[in-house]
Each structure stands twice: as structure tokens, then as C-alpha cells.
Amino acid sequence: RKIPKVGHTFFQKPESCPPVPGGSMKLDIGIINENQRVSMSRNIESRSTSPWNYTVTWDPNRYPSEVVQAQCRNLGCINAQGKEDISMNSVPIQQETLVVRRKHQGCSVSFQLEKVLVTVGCTCVTPVIHHVQ
Amino acid sequence: GITIPRNPGCPNSEDKNFPRTVMVNLNIHNRNTNTNPKRSSDYYNRSTSPWNLHRNEDPERYPSVIWEAKCRHLGCINADGNVDYHMNSVPIQQEILVLRREPPHCPNSFRLEKILVSVGCTCVTPIVHHVA
């Protein structure tokens, strides 16, 4: 999947655009908003009716090297009595993000953009029930 | 991808850090995943904390379209299909990396940008405090 060119007619390619070899693009990995602190709701993962745990995956050849993945703790959902209700389902909610992958080929290194699917949390859903004949 | 020769010390000296600027292949690696969450699942309608999806479009960003979730209710849907306000619908937020055209409007020059998106909603049982 290629990154689309700027297709809008009102865009003029500025003179200041850096020269880039064909088939590639220049990427500055100094992240915009890197230090922006977000106030996430405190421990929603354990107060949710579809609670989840977090696992950190680490890969030195990926940027960022740390990616956090969520896993639903239960198949069912937690009811008002604190018990698991298996008539409901805990399901993962996923979001795509971009990472930069470093590849080594002999004494050379190349970089590739990669889409990664991250599980960010879980939600409780009413299952669709089919009765099989 | 685009290969960059390593420094003369190769293979002994391995640079652990990523360089500040890299040349990357225009092709993005990974299964052509479905970027429209409405098509990929109907959890947003079946959840006890349902949400609506709003399209956020920005031609200076890749991906140019990002879907933002907004919880439909303050409370959660109970077994009778009514909103139970003793529970909370809470957005699940995630920081993601996108590409920002830099300088603006340049077709093949980007910078990584971190943005916060609401991906969906979950139902939460709040701890209750009575204020004296």
C-alpha cells in the first residue's frame, strides 16, 4: 500500500521540498508531540466490566521499540455481583499505528514503514446468537 | 526498503539507536488491513457502552482518515436495554503514530507525529465516594 501523493488541486508542491530518491521518502523520526503528557483515565482496565491486562512487547529493530498490547482477562463480562457472566462477551478493541522497521542485509541497513495492529482495551458486547440446525 | 551502507566499522559496531532521519520505502508493509472500523466489526453497536464513529480527515497526514469514537451515553446499557447511570461509558484512548507532511504539502517528506485517539468505549463500575 503506497502513501498517496498530495492529490488536492489547491496544493502546490513547494520549492522547499527536499530531493528524495525515487520509490522512497524522507522520514524524520523526531516525534511531534513526543513529550505531550496525556491524562488517561485511572485504571479503567481493572474497573471495566470487560477488564484487561497489558503486555509490553519489545523489539530493538522497531521504532518505537516498545509497543503495549492489551488482552481481555475473561471470555465473559463481570456483572454487578463481581461474577463472570458468560452470556456476554469481552472483546478486544483494536487500532492501527505506524512503526519504523530496521532491516539488516549484510553490512547494509534499510528502513521500512509498517502498520501494526494494537489491542488497546476490551469492551463488553451482546453476542449474536445463531441456532444451528 | 532503501539500503544505507553501514559505517566502516561493520559488522563490529552496531548502532543501537535509530538515526534522526531515515529514508524509507514508499510501500507500507502489512496486510491491507481494513481502516474503516465500521466495516471491520459491529462492536460499536453491540457494546454495553456503544459508541459513534466520527471521521477525522487531514490531507497533510498519513493516514489521512482516522476514525474517532464518541461514547453514545454517559451510562451503560443494561440487560433491559435501558441506560444504567450507576455505570459509566468511558472512552478507551490510545496514542498512535502517524506521518505529518513536513515541510507542508511535500509529497515525499514526512515526520512522525504522536496523536491521541479514542478507539472505542468500555463500561466501568466507578468507586463511589460520598463527599462530606
Epitope: S39, S41, R42, N43, I44, R47 | K70, C71, L74, N88, V90, V124, P126, I127, V128, H129, H130, V131
Partner: nanobody, 116 residues
């Protein structure tokens, strides 16, 4: 710790209006929503109205829709409930609620009596 100060309760006649106010102070950051419940003797507390902090989305109980209006002032961490066309069945103790997603704070309540 979070403090909630409710005001505006009192005795009014049917058809009259009343405005309830609630001010939050202390560590009231990351607000999810702010609103009001009410309770009459021997009954459970019922939701009246709520306003989401992030986008001012409002929700009302069916029994008050079209008569009550909830509004907020972000800069002051306050929420107001404008109650119009009051009915005898609106008589209750009204509780301010501050919701921080995983923690919820209840005020002490203010009495509203609608009687001729």
C-alpha cells in the same frame, strides 16, 4: 480530596422555576461527566441529567426532558440545572454527581419541594 458544594434548593409552587448549582473543588481533574440524581423517601436514587465534560454532550431522564436544562462552566468547574415547569413529582433531594470515570463523588444533596 474533592469537595462538592450544592446550592439553589427550596420550596416553589407548581409551574415555577428553580436553578440548582454545584461547584467542584480539590483534585477534580480528568472529569468524565457532571450531573444530578434525585431521591424521594423509600425510592432509589434516579438519574436526572448529566453533561459530558469533553464535548458538553447532555443526557436527560425522560421525566424531565424539555423542562430541565443542564449547563457547565469549564473554567469554574461548575454545573447548573435549570428546572422549569416544576411539578409536585419533582419534589426530592437532588444530589450533585462528579464522575471521574473510575471514581464518582456524590454531594450531600439539596432539597427541592414543589407544592401549592
Amino acid at each position: 480530596e474533592v469537595q462538592l458544594v450544592e446550592s439553589g434548593g427550596g420550596l416553589v409552587q407548581p409551574g415555577d422555576s428553580l436553578r440548582l448549582s454545584c461547584a467542584a473543588s480539590g483534585r477534580a481533574n480528568s472529569i468524565n461527566w457532571f450531573g444530578w440524581f434525585r431521591q424521594t423517601p423509600g425510592k432509589e436514587r434516579e438519574f436526572v441529567a448529566g453533561i459530558r465534560w469533553s464535548d458538553a454532550y447532555t443526557e436527560y431522564a425522560n421525566s424531565v426532558k424539555g423542562r430541565f436544562t443542564i449547563s457547565r462552566d469549564n473554567s469554574k468547574n461548575t454545573v447548573d440545572l435549570q428546572m422549569d415547569s416544576l411539578r409536585p413529582e419533582d419534589t426530592a433531594v437532588y444530589y450533585c454527581v462528579l464522575d471521574l470515570s473510575t471514581v464518582r463523588y456524590w454531594g450531600q444533596g439539596t432539597l427541592v419541594t414543589v407544592s401549592s
